[in-house]
């Protein structure tokens, strides 16, 4: 670390005095201090001498000696006071620029440490400081206004009490700049616009910033529009607004509109699209298939997207049958607006019951007319099975009826013993019926099929099982003959048990 001679922290001299400051280090050393006249600098290897034969109040300040080659960057300092009875202040700068919330140092250096007790900071022409101005004083550095605000951008003077009267410094102008976080904030309203030819339209482009220095313009398809600008200041922000009013829109007004604002930090732009149409429109669509299949007991949400201008005058979900005349609950219908001209309507069917299969229609109306979108909802059912013993053309026949959706497949099993359900170990024979007769196949209903198994003689210690399955599940019915008679016995002689 360099050493300064004289080895005191501060030195007080009178004007005209000779001052010699010597700095010695291990290597070459350098002096740094306030810019002032009459100093002579002499360097000799590891020492440097700063001297003047005629000290003035302008030499007041802190002189620091550094050793550039020192990796630790050590330095030494001495503060020099040149106490001039006529000039209590040495002002190092007459303009100070800071950003809001920074500390602002007003560099009026006191030339006589004795005067410290009577110093104060005032605004020019003797005006007091603004309320809430928080400041401190250092005789070596001057006055510091802490966390300066934009409103404190003023001209200040430093005041010292000398012989009962206040002596002012020359003025220091403080400029507190707003912290501009970036380019101005923009809004372009509306985000999207549709009008029928001949209607009126308004597009508003507005920009705001903490600083007044910014520009804003509106352009249509890359052409800058000449629009009068309205300016305002509120919520501590400057606002500039451009309003484009079109009394009767035509197709040439359609296209892309961009709102562009710029300042020193850069440029922001936002765009919207203006569509001019010949007449009202109403379009319904769905991302879902209009033919839906859901397993009974499960839930389904039907969604319709609506694009419309002008806005909807009415809309509703309607159940068109075929099972009942009850309509969907309003609370199960939900509407969400994606934007001004696009909406999504959802019908929630949380636990589908057999009577809720059928057609669901979404209807909407605007000045362009009515539109409808219809969903067809078919429910899937696991098969339900029953078996009876009957005679067909004199032959004993087991008749299996299976109903479900999708259409069930039928398999017959014959197994040993009496059982509710044949397992693999008991199975004696298996017959697949690839083409069971379809008894009924109406839209939205279960498909009922019938399969016949001709049995010449019913074996009494055996079980005949009809098993039906589809994509939802399977069902079966076990037929157990309980009679000692021959195959010609009427059906009520036999017991069929589930």
């Amino acid at each position: 670390i360099p050493v300064i001679e004289p080895s005191v922290p501060e030195l007080v001299v009178k004007p005209g005095a000779t001052v010699t400051l010597r700095c010695v280090g291990n290597g070459s050393v350098e002096w740094d201090g306030p810019p002032s006249p009459h100093w002579t600098l002499y360097s000799d290897g590891s020492s440097s001498i700063l001297s003047t034969n005629n000290a003035t109040f302008q030499n007041t300040g802190t002189y620091r000696c550094t050793e550039p080659g020192d990796p630790l960057g050590g330095s030494a300092a001495i503060h020099l006071y040149v106490k001039d009875p006529a000039r209590p202040w040495n002002v190092l700068a007459q303009e100070v620029v800071v950003f809001e919330d920074q500390d602002a140092l007003l560099p009026c250096l006191l030339t006589d440490p004795v005067l410290e007790a009577g110093v104060s900071l005032v605004r020019v022409r003797g005006r007091p400081l603004m309320r809430h101005t928080n400041y401190s004083f250092s005789p070596w550095h001057g006055f510091t206004i802490h966390r300066a605000k934009f409103i404190q951008s003023q001209d200040y003077q430093c005041s010292a009490l000398m012989g009962g009267r206040k002596v002012m410094s020359i003025s220091i102008r403080l400029k507190v700049q707003k912290v501009i976080p970036g380019p101005p904030a923009l809004t372009l309203v509306p985000a999207e616009l549709v009008r029928i030819r001949g209607e009126a339209a308004q597009i508003v482009c507005s920009a705001s910033s903490v600083d007044v220095n910014f520009d804003v313009f509106l352009q249509h398809n890359n052409t800058k529009l000449a629009i009068p600008q309205q300016s305002d200041f509120h919520n501590n922000r400057y606002q500039k607004v451009l309003t484009l009013n079109l009394d009767q829109v035509d197709f040439q007004h359609a296209g892309n509109y961009s709102c562009v604002a710029s300042n020193v930090q850069g440029k922001h732009s936002t765009s919207m699209f203006f569509r001019v149409v010949e007449s009202a429109y109403l379009n319904l669509s769905s991302e879902q298939n209009l033919i839906q299949e859901v397993t009974v007991g499960e839930g389904l949400n039907l969604k319709v997207m609506v694009e419309a201008y002008p806005g909807l005058q009415g809309f509703n979900w309607t159940y068109l049958g075929p099972f009942s005349d009850h309509q969907p609950e309003p609370k199960l219908a939900n509407a969400t607006t994606k934007d001004t001209y696009r909406h999504t309507f959802t019908l929630s069917l949380p636990r589908l019951k057999p009577s809720e299969a059928g057609r669901y229609s979404f209807l909407a109306r605007n000045p362009g007319g009515w539109r409808a979108l219809t969903f067809e909802l078919t429910l899937r059912y696991p098969p339900e099975v029953s078996v009876i013993w009957t005679f067909i053309n004199g032959s004993g026949t087991l008749l299996c009826a299976a109903s479900g959706y999708p259409q069930p497949n039928v398999t017959w099993l014959q197994c040993s013993g009496h059982t509710d359900r044949c397992d693999e170990a008991q199975v004696l024979q298996v017959w697949d019926d690839p083409y069971p007769e379809v008894l009924s196949q109406e839209p939205f209903h279960k498909v009922t099929v019938q399969s016949l198994l001709t049995v010449e003689t019913l074996e009494h210690n055996q079980t005949y099982e009809c098993r039906a399955h589809n994509s939802v599940g399977s069902g079966s019915w076990a037929f157990i003959p309980i009679s000692a008679g021959a195959h010609t016995h009427p059906p009520d002689e036999f017991l069929f048990t589930p």
């Epitope: 007991g297 009942s324 609950e329 696991p382 939802v472």
Partner: antibody, heavy 115, light 108 residues
């Protein structure tokens, strides 16, 4: 076509656990919701709870702390367990299928709780 | 929970007469998910009407249901001897599913 057949212990002591099973015949447990309902002697019907094929359950809040309903799709069966029974749980217990309301019912099992 | 109140508690009529049974809900029944059941001594209940007005499979057309919201009615247009039983209404629109206390239809 579809029939529900139920079984289980008919006589219990207080604090024991009631256990009933319901089998689905001629159809499948793989869709619909399946419920348990009870009816105290000479009184009205009370819904106990339900289960679907994926095992999702829903219980009557008045019994929720004591009820467990479980299902076995491979056997086409579902079961009811009611713990810590008292005399107030004496009732005929029914299993039922919910399609449009409770369209198919079991034959009922009389359960008596007595010390 | 939704409380269902049936009236009258007992209805005494003769075969051939018209029976009107009422069921009132403490709050609106979702999507008219209201059912009517018939129960005879020693038997399980039998579904008559679902969705407030739809007849279940195999139910004679002398049975009809009507109503929405909180007020529902079961009508038997011409009583047959086998119709004398206890009738329950039930809502299955919101959990817990609840039944009315029942209306006993007896022979006068």
């Amino acid at each position: 076509q579809v029939q529900l057949q139920q079984w289980g212990a008919g006589l219990l002591k207080p604090s024991e656990t009631l256990s009933l099973t319901c089998a689905v015949y001629g159809g499948s447990f793989s869709a619909y919701y399946w419920s348990w309902i009870r009816q105290p002697p000479g009184k009205g019907l009370e819904w106990i709870g339900e289960i679907n094929h994926s095992g999702s359950t829903n219980y009557n809040p008045s019994l929720k702390s004591r009820v467990t309903i479980s299902g076995d799709t491979s056997k086409n069966q579902f079961s009811l367990k009611l713990s810590s029974v008292t005399a107030a749980d004496t009732a005929v217990y029914y299993c039922a299928r919910e399609a449009d309301a409770f369209d198919i019912w079991g034959q009922g099992t009389m359960v008596t709780v007595s010390s | 929970e939704i409380v269902l109140t049936q009236s009258p508690g007992t209805l005494s009529l003769s075969p051939g007469e018209r029976a009107t049974l009422s069921c009132r809900a403490s709050q609106s029944v979702s999507s008219s998910y209201l059912a009517w059941y018939q129960q005879k001594p020693g038997q399980a209940p039998r579904l008559l009407i679902y969705g407030a007005s739809s007849r279940a499979t195999g139910i004679p057309d002398r049975f009809s249901g009507s109503g929405s919201g909180t007020d529902f009615t079961l009508t038997i247009s011409r009583l047959e001897p086998e119709d004398f039983a206890v009738y329950y209404c039930q809502q299955y629109g919101s959990s817990p599913y609840t039944f009315g206390q029942g209306t006993k239809l007896e022979i006068k």
